[in-house]
């Protein structure tokens, strides 16, 4: 079906990956579709096969080069097409002129580690992955801590309005198991969104010393 509601959304990870999701109400699940990328000022083009992620939604990753290579800049425009096979020919189902640095979503932060832990506080660091050098220090972070008996959705968000790849969590309970996550977002880009949350880092605060107030 071509008359259902259709949405074609893509994000650039700032280095060498464009991730796309296409949804089409009424489209057949077994339809063979792909995303084609055609830059306006580069000699390469790239294709990826859309794979189903839900009843009416497909996704794929355009791998533009080595993970840390800078394949696009702020002046690039990439024409992105969804093409679906109909019999012996391909039909264009969706199209957009994609401005990479207006549609950023970075990779989740990696290498989370506990730098120092005490009874009431914990210092945690992390690294950003595959982030363009163009950003310099123009990044922000959000972090959250999972306390016992709560859900991630209930966890208050801690905002770091600068490129700070560490945090000191305070007012923690002694001898308690916690989990910690962080995500990153460039300040640039009209349609830029937060990265996925990092893998959770589990840690335990130290027990209070015997005979001392906690």
């Amino acid at each position: 079906a071509v008359n259902g509601t259709s949405q074609f959304t893509c994000f650039y990870n700032s280095r060498a990956n464009i991730s796309c999701v296409w949804s089409q109400d009424g489209a057949l699940q077994d339809t063979s579709c792909q995303v084609h990328a055609w830059p306006d000022r580069r000699r390469w083009n790239q294709t990826c096969e859309l794979l189903p992620v839900s009843q009416a939604s497909w996704a794929c990753n355009l791998i533009l080069g080595a993970p840390d290579s800078q394949k696009l800049t702020t002046v690039d425009i990439v024409t992105l097409r969804v093409l679906c096979r109909e019999g012996v020919r391909w039909r264009v189902m969706a199209i957009q002129d994609f401005k990479p640095f207006e549609n950023l979503r970075l990779m989740a932060p990696i290498s989370l580690q506990v730098v120092h832990v005490e009874t009431h506080r914990c210092n945690i660091s992390w690294e950003i992955s595959q982030a363009s050098h163009y950003f310099e220090r123009h990044l922000e972070f959000e972090a959250r801590t999972l306390s016992p008996g709560h859900t991630w959705e209930e966890a208050p968000l801690l905002t770091l309005k600068q490129k700070q790849e560490w945090i000191c969590l305070e007012t923690l309970t002694p001898d308690t198991q916690y989990e910690f996550q962080v995500r990153v977002k460039p300040l640039q880009g009209e349609f830029t969104t937060w990265s996925p949350w990092s893998q959770p880092l589990a840690f335990r605060t130290k027990p209070a010393a015997l005979g001392k107030d906690t």
């Epitope: 071509v2 074609f8 306006d40 024409t79 969804v82 264009v92 189902m93 199209i95 957009q96 002129d97």
Partner: nanobody, 126 residues
Framework: QVQLVESGGGLVQAGGSLRLSCAAS????????MGWFRQAPGKEREFVAA????????VYVDSVKGRFTISRDNAKNTVYLQMNTLKPEDTAVYYC???????????????????WGQGTQVTVSS
């Protein structure tokens, strides 16, 4: 499938004007962008102009900017190409095309369009 019928072509002197029309029938509910292409003898078919479903976005090949105007009447399922200040190099068969593709680009190609008319001849004499 969508059926397209062009009209309005003909022989005109350089500097003159023509207005091409293209009437769509069939599965017109599936039409999004409508466009015009042209093909001169011995040359590849080239993009001329396109207009979005709502009519609020248009794009033209550089060589016709300021001379050609694309418009559409959704109630009549018709797209028009007003061609002014015609030049001998505008001589070609002009084709109307439609696409079901959702979205917009400034870089339309023949592959983006799935329904085509038979074409109408435009000849500009010097």
């Amino acid at each position: 499938q969508v059926q397209l019928v062009e009209s309005g072509g003909g022989l005109v002197q350089a500097g003159g004007s023509l207005r091409l029309s293209c009437a769509a029938s069939g599965r017109t509910f599936s039409i999004n962008t409508m466009g015009w292409f042209r093909q001169a003898p011995g040359k590849e078919r080239e993009f001329v102009a396109a207009i979005s479903r709502s009519g609020d976005s248009t794009v033209y090949v550089d060589s016709v900017k300021g001379r050609f105007t694309i418009s559409r009447d959704n109630a009549k399922n018709t797209v028009y190409l007003q061609m002014n200040t015609l030049k001998p190099e505008d001589t070609a068969v002009y084709y109307c095309a439609t696409t079901v593709a959702v979205g917009w680009t400034t870089r339309w190609s023949t592959i983006d369009f799935d329904s085509w008319g038979q074409g109408t001849q435009v000849t500009v004499s010097s």
